[in-house]
């Protein structure tokens, strides 16, 4: 769809003749007549097959036309078209006389054709002007003429409609070739495509308008390239969506079981070397002159009795001193100056001869030690107690305190935490150093098997077109993250965007 | 061939929220090709454009309707739907679904045969 | 809010044309769709795009829009064609309907 303009600029009849050349009374009261027609080798006569049109009086003999197209007049006159441009045109422009007001061509004697000017060739769309001259015996004819395309038609032959918009079925202008151009932000075919914000992750992000960036199930953050973790995890992170993966020193579902108390307590007090024994559990080796579970008391060097035969100890600022009684000697009072006849083993200990009666030892009875048997046996020498028991020399009965998981005369033994049968649903227990596990059947999960859960949502394989499939333990549902080129729950659609209907 | 199918109830009391659903079958609603919409019109009068979707889930409303509109979208069941609340005599009409072209003029191809409500207590 | 005048009514004889306008601020700027809807049935699609036919709509159907007017043209009307016909274009983001044109058959 187009428009053929053309544009009278100046008439010339000096003598003010018709074409018969008989003259005008008074003067040539001028109007034309324009027939525009397919290509024709020779111009005939026959219908105006691209349209016709015709002027007012414009002037009488000779004149010039002026230019009305701002002030909505008639030149340049307008032959629209509703076709594609053939690129090629034939013009008759007649100019003739009125005598009177009816300008019809049935209102006019024949001979008042002034003159008839035929010209064709080839003229192609464009905004520039052809002038054109035109000259007979009596007549001169200046006018200049184009083809341009009509509002929203665009191309060399003003076949291809186009009309901007943004709006949800496009975001785009025309290019001069009738071709889209899209709008900052916008791609596709109709530019209905926006761009996300740049870095936005090509699978696990999208967006429905320019310059953001939407996640999809699964993903976090500004660019949607990071994975959200199994819902309740707490010290573990995630390269797929709903992972929990334990951080160094955790373990559990959860990641919320501490397998390095150590580290994260720093439970051995005075420097003591602590080594992990267990969930939540520890060992602290003390450093000398230190005792208790985490190393908390100090030891006097005289708590452990370094002086034998019933020597005093008395502690001295770089150590301890031993003082003997009457018939010992040495550091610990370790050496012995009295020999079986002095009767030196007490408690009901026997004395034995040694070295030829130069020297004895003594054999003790039952809960007595010593060279002598002077000394009640104390009990916590040996470290009896197991399991970072505390040991307690005094007390008729109990010897050792215990930690919390453990019992026995030694703390030798596990409370059984399994005892109470806590795991629900048919759930296996477990015991630990400290605590218990449950190992639960399908279908059932959680610290005590508690939590009915479905079986895997991706067992059943969901996902179409090689989509990764996530469960969401959270919700029992499973999640598609679809590969590039395929959308829906279950990635089974490819994207596309074919024209529904064809050009 | 394409063919939508509205559904709902036929009667809404004042002040309650109308809900219809249109079942798309013989095409895919996850089509870029198309949005679906919901156009209406009450008896004796002309059509009315209430709103459109995306398959993505990309919603555009009459601003006449706006507040009170939601439609969405079901790519599992192949359905969209219509939910108007709020609603007063003035909602009383036939409810069309149909199938509107993604692209250039998004002329409506398809319609749903429609379904009457009424609003009345 | 954008608005789409059309003439309540249009009467034609069996076998001539008749035009059915379709009045809006800029419309030739924008794609024109019409519908005809008979008593009773659904609206259909008779053109889209300005000018375009959907398959199965008669030839005698045919569109233009320029300026502010498209027009709707029925040449060699039949008593089928007798029924109600809008028009549709869409304003920014918003479907617009024309008021309705009764096509009656003489």
């Known amino acids: 769809s187009g428009v053929f303009q053309l544009q009278l600029q100046e008439f010339i009849n000096e003598r003010g003749v018709l074409a018969s050349g008989r003259p005008c009374e008074p003067g040539c009261r001028t109007f034309f007549r324009v027939c525009l027609k397919h290509f024709q080798a020779v111009v005939s006569p026959g219908p105006c097959t691209f349209g016709t049109v015709s002027t007012p009086v414009l002037g009488t003999n000779s004149f010039a036309v002026r230019d009305d197209s701002s002030g909505g007049g008639r030149n340049p006159l307008q032959l629209p078209f509703n076709f594609t441009w053939p690129g090629t045109f034939s013009l008759i422009i007649e100019a003739w006389h009125a005598p009177g007001d009816d300008l019809r061509p049935e209102a006019l004697p024949p001979d008042a054709l002034i003159s008839k000017i035929a010209i064709q060739g080839s003229l192609a769309v464009g905004q520039n002007w052809l002038l054109d001259e035109q000259t007979s015996t009596l007549t001169r004819l200046r006018y200049s003429y184009r083809v341009i395309c009509s509002d929203n038609y665009y191309g060399d032959n003003c076949s291809r409609l186009c009309k901007k918009r943004n709006d949800h079925f496009g975001h785009y202008v025309c290019q001069p070739d009738g071709n889209l151009s899209c709008l900052p932000g916008w791609t596709g075919e109709y530019c209905q495509q926006p761009i996300c914000l740049s870095g936005c992750h090509e699978q696990n992000g999208y967006c429905s308008k320019p310059a953001e960036c939407l996640c999809r199930p699964g993903w976090q953050g500004r660019l949607c390239n990071e994975c959200i973790p199994h819902n309740g995890c707490r010290h573990g992170t995630c390269s797929t969506p709903w992972q929990c993966t334990c951080d160094e020193g955790w373990g559990g579902l959860f990641c919320d079981q501490d397998l390095n108390y150590c580290t994260h307590h720093s439970p051995c007090k005075n420097g003591a070397t602590c080594s992990n024994s267990g969930q939540r559990s520890y060992t602290c080796t003390c450093r000398p002159g230190y005792t208790g579970v985490d190393c908390e008391l100090e030891l006097s060097e005289c708590d452990s009795n370094p002086c034998r035969n019933g020597g005093s100890c008395k502690d001295q600022e770089d150590g301890y001193h031993c003082l003997c009684p009457p018939g010992y000697y040495g550091l610990h009072c370790e050496h012995s100056t009295l020999s079986c006849a002095d009767s030196p083993c007490f408690n009901g200990g026997s004395c034995r001869e040694r070295n030829q009666g130069a020297n004895y030892a003594c054999e003790c009875p039952p809960n007595f030690t010593g060279s002598n048997c002077e000394k009640k046996v104390d009990r916590c020498t040996s470290n009896p107690c197991a399991n970072g028991g505390q040991c307690l020399n005094r007390g008729p009965s109990r010897m050792c305190r215990c930690r919390p998981g453990f019992t026995g005369t030694y703390c030798e033994l596990h409370v059984s935490d399994c005892a109470r049968n806590p795991c629900a649903h048919g759930g296996t227990c477990h015991d630990l150093e400290n605590g218990l596990m449950c190992t639960c059947p399908a279908g059932f999960s959680g610290r005590r098997c508690e939590v009915r859960t479905s079986i895997d949502a991706c067992a059943s394989s969901p996902c179409f077109n090689r989509a990764t499939c996530y469960t969401d333990l959270s919700t029992d549902t499973f999640v598609c993250n679809c590969p590039y080129g395929f959308v829906g729950s279950r990635c089974e659609f490819p994207v596309g965007l074919p024209p529904s209907f064809p050009w | 061939e394409v063919q939508l199918q509205e559904s709902g109830p036929g009667l809404v009391k004042p002040s309650e929220t109308l809900s219809l659903t249109c079942t798309v079958s013989g095409g895919s609603i996850s089509s870029s090709s198309y949005y679906w919409g919901w156009i209406r019109q009450p008896p004796g009068k002309g059509l009315e454009w209430i709103g459109d979707i995306y398959y993505t889930g990309s919603t555009y409303y009459n601003p006449s309707l706006k507040s009170r509109v939601t439609i969405s979208v079901d790519t599992s069941k192949n359905q969209f739907s219509l939910k108007l609340s709020s609603v007063t005599a003035a909602d009383t009409a036939v409810y069309y679904c149909?199938?509107?072209?993604?692209?250039?003029?998004?002329?409506?191809?398809?319609w749903g045969q429609g379904t009457l409500v009424t609003v009345s207590s | 809010s954008y608005e789409l005048t059309q003439p309540p009514s249009v009467s034609v004889s069996p076998g001539q044309t008749a035009s059915i306008t379709c009045s809006g601020q800029?419309?030739?700027?924008?794609?024109a769709s019409w519908y005809q809807q008979k008593p009773g049935q659904s609206p259909v699609l008779v053109i889209y795009?300005?000018?375009k036919r959907p398959s199965g709509i008669p030839e005698r159907f045919s569109g233009s829009n320029s300026g502010d007017t498209a027009t709707l043209t029925i040449s060699g009307t039949q008593p089928m064609d007798e029924a109600d016909y809008y028009c549709q274009a869409w304003d920014r983001d918003t479907g617009v309907f024309g008021y309705g044109t009764k096509v009656t058959v003489l």
């Open positions: 800029r419309l030739g700027d924008k794609y």
């Open positions: 149909a199938r509107e072209e993604a692209i250039l003029g998004g002329g409506s191809d398809y």
């Open positions: 795009e300005d000018s």
